[in-house]
Amino acid sequence: TTPEPCELDDEDFRCVCNFSEPQPDWSEAFQCVSAVEVEIHAGGLNLEPFLKRVDADADPRQYADTVKALRVRRLTVGAAQVPAQLLVGALRVLAYSRLKELTLEDLKITGTMPPLPLEATGLALSSLRLRNVSWATGRSWLAELQQWLKPGLKVLSIAQAHSPAFSCEQVRAFPALTSLDLSDNPGLGERGLMAALCPHKFPAIQNLALRNTGMETPTGVCAALAAAGVQPHSLDLSHNSLRATVNPSAPRCMWSSALNSLNLSFAGLEQVPKGLPAKLRVLDLSCNRLNRAPQPDELPEVDNLTLDGNPFLVPGTALPHEGSMNSGVVPAC
């Protein structure tokens, strides 16, 4: 016997559906109506036939009361080929729900997204996460998707993007966006970062994550941030192969005074990079290749310094910097 495609936990909190059959019984998903967090994995299916069964142009207000009764706050949809018209239809209906967090992963969006009708209500998400989502529309996908969302989005995460650069002239500002995560886009690089950080479109960013994004030097990242007018409080550059030295011909970059936390862990550093901010609250240099304790003049003025997992650190060695946070135990790096 084949396992049930959908499983609801005994507290009506989490519901997970794995539709792997070629002709899935989508009605099984109805058991998720009372769940707060819902995950639907469509097994790589092409959802094109759905368009024949649903009226994507129907007024979503007719479903408003039904959708309002859903408890779902967080929805994950993955592994499918989705016509843009169907995605838009779903977003229009979900605008009447309590949905706050939407994750789309391993999706291929086909066709173009129609413009938002004047009477339509945008989806009031606080968090949107995309992983390995491809769009037929190329660089304009973010602007097209954005029009279906209310302007209150706080967290945007885009990983394994097929087109991490955006059509900046079409993108509207994200006035409430405080966290932007572009991690796991190894082809991004510093030039790509400049293209992705559309100038003045991200005025409220406090946390910027750039793990595994092909960044080369902290100074290059500083320049990209300065060009975009982005002033994060926290910057994560971990899991990049960073160079410690700066190109002498490159102009010196002044970091924003707003930056107080910098993560440079797992960056393959053999020495402390040049051109770091002069003052930081938190600096993480753990799991690098530092062969000697950094000298005070190599480091910013820092309250919390983490150096765990570097070769020079042997358990029991005196702490190399006042206020450092080393455990004395070499972590699994």
């Epitope: 507290e11 909190f13 707060v36 009764a69 968090s127």
Partner: antibody, heavy 115, light 111 residues
Framework: QLQLQESGPGLVKPSETLSLTCTVS?????????WNWIRQPPGKGLEWIGY???????SYNPSLKSRVTISRDTSKNQFSLKLSSVTAADTAVYYC????????WGQGTLVTVSS | DIQLTQSPSSLSASVGDRVTITCRAS??????????LHWYQQKPGKAPKLLIY???NLQSGVPSRFSGSGSRTDFTLTISSLQPEDVATYYC?????????FGQGTKLEIK
Amino acid sequence: QLQLQESGPGLVKPSETLSLTCTVSGGSISSDSAWNWIRQPPGKGLEWIGYISYSGSTSYNPSLKSRVTISRDTSKNQFSLKLSSVTAADTAVYYCVRGLRFAYWGQGTLVTVSS
Amino acid sequence: DIQLTQSPSSLSASVGDRVTITCRASESVDSYVDSFLHWYQQKPGKAPKLLIYRASNLQSGVPSRFSGSGSRTDFTLTISSLQPEDVATYYCQQSNEDPYTFGQGTKLEIK
């Protein structure tokens, strides 16, 4: 058998940040459910503060949202509460609780806000 | 926010009495087939204990003299035959919509 245990300072000064940790045994905080903080001022009723879910998603009571952060450390199977800018009105017994029908509770820890 | 109002605020009854506590919600706490309304018992100095979940389901280990009923906005907790150990404060709570809210409590004493 699932068990939850609150820990943290019993006395916090006004305007400072209250920090509590809940250690969970007999179940994983990253495999299912919501992991809540609920408080009860002396002689009063219960108030839900917020939760962090198995996925890391958080939800907070709007009345406290600007002051609350709930985070987790999955390696230690712990979740934590930070409540900033506390006043005497934040004096309460703080409970960590599993689920949204609150079937599993810690024994509670009294936090007094006083100078 | 969904407000929950319990009545009475306190009551005194004799051992063996049938006791009823009501909880009224400011809006429906139903989601399709289920009512997300739960009942708790709290004894002095102790954490609350779940008695009834989703309006009418008895939590494992709870004596069968406790029962719950109701839907949408009106709910009832019934103790069919009051026992001395039932002296406590009883709370209703909704988990249909965040913020998740509690009733103000009903204090039950023995005459």
